[in-house]
Interface confidence: low
């Protein structure tokens, strides 16, 4: 008699009596273990049992032939009882085993079926029988398989017109987009529901299987909340009788995981920061839908803050750290804020930031916020679970590491304070540092706020000055005259604190406001008309656009240029402070060298390189190598001096200067000088990627061009101040090398 054969497209080995067939399917056709077993039995066979290496090899050949590498396939492995262990669904004992390392492990006590990994190891793993997998059927040689069962119509639950899945008495919405918990919950509530509360194993299984079948995201917010004292509550108020935590969860990592997600690969739950965007599941009762009803909007109730706290936008803020002994590390600061019934501040927008900056005037410290990346490096989250919708990083931050010690990761975020031009910006710092800190609580409807104190003539005191926002539209020169008539001057803004204050004054006006910065009176150099030196600037992206113009504070808090005959509101300022006069020109001399000829002008020395062209980055490094930086041009006089010097070289090249545009679109000098003078060529600045600036040797005007262009360059450094007779050596920041005072100095300007 002929040897029994396998049906066409079934695989066999000469040494076994079984034939095998792979069923590798798309996501929507995968099956649970039980569905797969029933499918194979309907053919007259069963799920595959692997009894020796030959059978394993046969299946591997099928995998390679069909290109099904790394896919997962159900085998007939099923867990009977503790005494039996795993058996094959065809009734044969498990005599040959090929478990993966550490398997079977019955992870979370739910893994009672076996799958095969389609890679060269062909290893087995125990897994939840409700998972959706591909599968492998077996049939006896010589047997003709019955027709494949026609797939039962997907028992997909019915769906409402607006996309909610109906199951028993409830409807569920499975989001495709990821949101913070607050936004997710707002969506559910707008649709007459809330984030899902899961009351039973069967409800969890339904949700888990649904997301598994339908292009699941990796995890979904559910409606479970964890309070700061680690108590659980469903958002809809129902009792927490059923939970399904993943192994090791909830772990309350960094004490700021107060929301819960369901993993789509297992259905188990994990605690997570509420501000981390995830997909989400909403739930509403079948009877809760009434498309004609609109969700009521809560009327805003007047509220206030306790004594010593500052009210803004229905929140109360308090800054600690003005006294040294108040300062704490991040963990202690958070504990203190929680003690006040709040948490470390979470800053939601520019206005809140400005309010905090305004209140940090006179600080000598930086202050902790709730932002941190403790749990996941480079993923910054607010410790109170608010979403990160706004950031205000300082230049070069977040930086990440402060030292090679792994305890010294800079994982917590401060608002910079003190006399820095970066005040109000954010910086990541080591969480163990003692800093000031800012607490935030909800405002209290039982309290009201004292009104702001305004002097009888409409001026508001801030720091050592008083300000009045004049709510009438004047041209810049008219505004200047008007301020003078009212015993004040048009306002200069000398630091980030005053800028925040001025911007907050504009909050209700919705109008642009003239300030005292002007270049049409001073040979195109932007100067404060009240004689203060320009040390701080807050230019908008691509500003200053105009060479000869006046400056206004725009509605976004940034400075912009406009023709002085335009009409805007304006800010007047009274101050008893006397502006510091320009220091007299520095004496000193320039470095001497056979290779580099430094040219003196006022307090600086300049080196002009026309022979060797470089791109902007290389030019900047070359200057650095010589103890200098690419030139900053800060006045019309300096511009004229350089134009005169480079004009003879116009046939050779144009010259890089130290002006560049950062990723936010702000023009900056590489040596951090304020941008108080510009000399743009007509039509410049232009072009999106043209982020570096060259000086035209023929005209002295500037153009922004691509940083990779090759140009000459100009370096600049402070003059060297020689030692006084007392042998006390004065040096500049840029060059601390001791100069030989005995050498004659031929190049003093």
């Amino acid at each position: 008699t002929p040897e029994p054969k396998c049906p066409e497209d079934w695989g066999a080995s000469s040494r076994t009596s079984l034939c095998f067939k792979l069923y590798a399917k798309g996501k929507h056709e995968k099956k649970t273990w039980f569905e797969s077993r029933d499918f194979c039995r309907a053919l007259g066979g069963d799920l595959a049992s692997i009894n020796n290496k030959e059978e394993q090899q046969t299946i591997w050949r099928l995998i390679t032939a069909s290109g099904s590498y790394h896919k997962l396939f159900w085998l007939g492995l099923t867990y009977g009882s503790p005494s039996e262990g795993f058996t094959w669904s065809d009734g044969s004992p498990v005599s040959y085993e090929n478990w993966a390392y550490g398997e079977p492990n019955n992870y979370q006590n739910v893994e009672y079926c076996g799958e095969l990994k389609g890679d060269p190891t062909m290893s087995w793993n125990d897994i939840n029988c409700e998972h959706l997998n591909n599968w492998i059927c077996q049939i006896q040689k010589g047997q003709t398989p019955k027709p494949e069962p026609t797939p039962a119509p997907q028992d997909n639950p019915p769906v409402t017109e607006d996309g909610w899945v109906i199951y028993k008495d409830y409807q569920y919405y499975f989001s495709k987009e990821k949101e913070t918990m607050d936004n997710a919950r707002a969506f559910c509530k707008r649709n007459f529901g809330d984030l899902v509360s899961i009351q039973s194993e069967s409800e969890k299984k339904f949700l888990w299987k649904y997301v598994n079948r339908n292009d699941a995201q990796s995890a979904y917010f559910i409606g479970l909340l964890i309070s700061l004292d680690k108590k659980f509550a469903w958002m809809d108020g129902s009792k927490v009788d059923y939970v399904s935590w993943a192994t090791g969860e909830p772990n309350f990592a960094n004490e700021d995981e107060n929301c819960v997600t369901m993993y789509s690969n297992s259905g188990f739950w994990n605690d997570i920061n509420c501000g981390y965007p995830n997909a989400f599941i909403c739930q509403r009762h079948n009877s809760s839908i009434n498309a004609t009803t609109v969700m009521p909007t809560m009327p805003s109730v007047p509220s206030g803050c306790k004594e010593g706290w500052n009210f803004y936008s229905n929140k109360c803020f308090k800054i600690f750290g003005f006294m040294e002994e108040e300062r704490k590390n991040w963990q202690e600061a958070r504990k203190a804020c929680i003690g006040f019934g709040g948490n470390l501040v979470s800053i939601q927008n520019e206005k809140e930031q400005a309010f905090l900056t305004y209140h940090m005037k006179d600080s000598t410290f930086s202050a902790w916020t709730g932002l941190n990346d403790v749990n996941s490096e480079h993923t910054f989250l607010w410790t109170d679970g608010r979403g990160v919708h706004y950031t205000n990083w300082g230049k070069g931050y977040p930086g990440g590491r402060r030292s090679s010690l792994s305890y010294e990761d800079a994982d917590c975020v401060v608002i910079i304070g003190g006399a820095s031009n970066e005040a109000g910006k954010w910086m990541d710092d080591t969480c163990d540092s003692k800093r000031g800190y800012i607490c935030q609580t909800r405002s209290d409807p039982s309290l009201t706020n004292p009104p702001a104190t305004i002097q009888t003539d409409g001026f508001v005191k801030y720091g050592k000055s008083s300000y009045s926002l004049m709510r009438q539209k004047f041209q810049w020169h008219e505004a200047e005259t008007y301020c003078k008539l009212h015993n004040s001057l048009i306002a200069s803004i000398l630091d980030p604190y005053s800028n925040a204050f001025a911007w907050l004054q504009m909050e209700t006006s919705n109008e642009r406001v003239w300030i005292a910065l002007n270049s049409n009176l001073t040979d195109n150099q932007y100067t404060w008309t009240d004689k203060w030196r320009v040390r701080y600037t807050n230019w908008a992206a691509d500003e200053p656009k105009l060479k000869s113009a006046c400056v206004y504070l725009d509605l976004d808090g940034y400075w912009k240029t406009a023709h002085c005959n335009e009409s805007f509101y304006f800010l007047c300022k009274r101050s008893d402070e006397i502006p510091a006069t320009e220091p007299p020109q520095l004496p000193g001399r320039c470095p001497e060298s056979d290779h580099t000829a430094w040219i003196p002008f006022h307090g600086h020395c300049y080196y002009i390189e026309s022979s060797y062209t470089r791109n902007w980055g290389q030019a900047s490094l070359e200057c650095l190598r010589m103890g200098s930086s690419l030139v900053s041009i800060e006045s019309a006089a300096e511009s004229s001096f350089l134009s005169y010097r480079v004009e003879p070289l116009k046939s050779k090249t144009n010259f890089w200067i130290g002006l560049f545009r950062n990723v936010e679109g702000t023009w900056l000098w590489i040596n951090n000088s304020p941008v108080s003078f510009v000399n743009w060529n007509t039509g410049d600045p232009s072009g999106e990627r043209n982020d570096c600036v060259a000086l035209h040797a023929s005209s002295g005007f500037w153009s922004n061009i691509h940083c990779s262009s090759y140009k000459g360059y100009i370096c600049k450094r402070p003059k060297i101040i020689d030692a006084k007779p007392t042998h006390e050596l004065l040096t500049t920041k840029a060059d601390t090398r001791k100069m030989d005072p005995s050498k004659p100095s031929s190049n003093v300007a």
Epitope: Q331, V374, S404, L405, S406, D409
Partner: nanobody
């Protein structure tokens, strides 16, 4: 994946010494700060000591300061806990752990990899 295997536990008289060892295999050992934790029957898991990646910074629980010393030999993928002047209250299962997130050194949730533990019993 990192596997951690502790050894060196045992029964010792009060006042005696033990040296626990933790052998690490798998991913790059030097990438992790390492810690020792202990758990006595019926009690919470408790931080004992931790050492930074480079080995030049250490932390200790107040209860073991001055008596226990943590060290590491990155070339051998080993972490050690030298325990002197042992007390009965040091009796516990001692676990070695590798820190995988930037948690405070004493926070158990910051350690992603754990060994099975080695039993230390101090008799009076």
């Amino acid at each position: 994946q990192v596997q951690l295997q502790e050894s060196g536990g045992g029964l010792v008289q009060a006042g005696g010494s033990l040296r626990l060892s933790c052998a690490a295999s798998g991913r790059i050992f030097s990438a992790y700060a390492m810690g020792w934790f202990r758990q006595a029957p019926g009690k919470e898991r408790e931080f004992v000591a931790a050492i930074s990646r480079s080995g030049d910074s250490t932390d200790y629980a107040d209860s073991v300061k001055g008596r226990f010393t943590i060290s590491r030999d990155s070339a051998k993928n080993m972490v050690y806990l030298q325990m002197n002047s042992l007390k009965p209250e040091d009796t516990a299962l001692y676990h070695c752990a590798a820190r995988t997130v930037s948690a405070p050194p004493s926070a158990a949730w910051g350690y992603g990899y754990w060994g099975q533990g080695t039993q230390v019993t101090v008799s009076s």
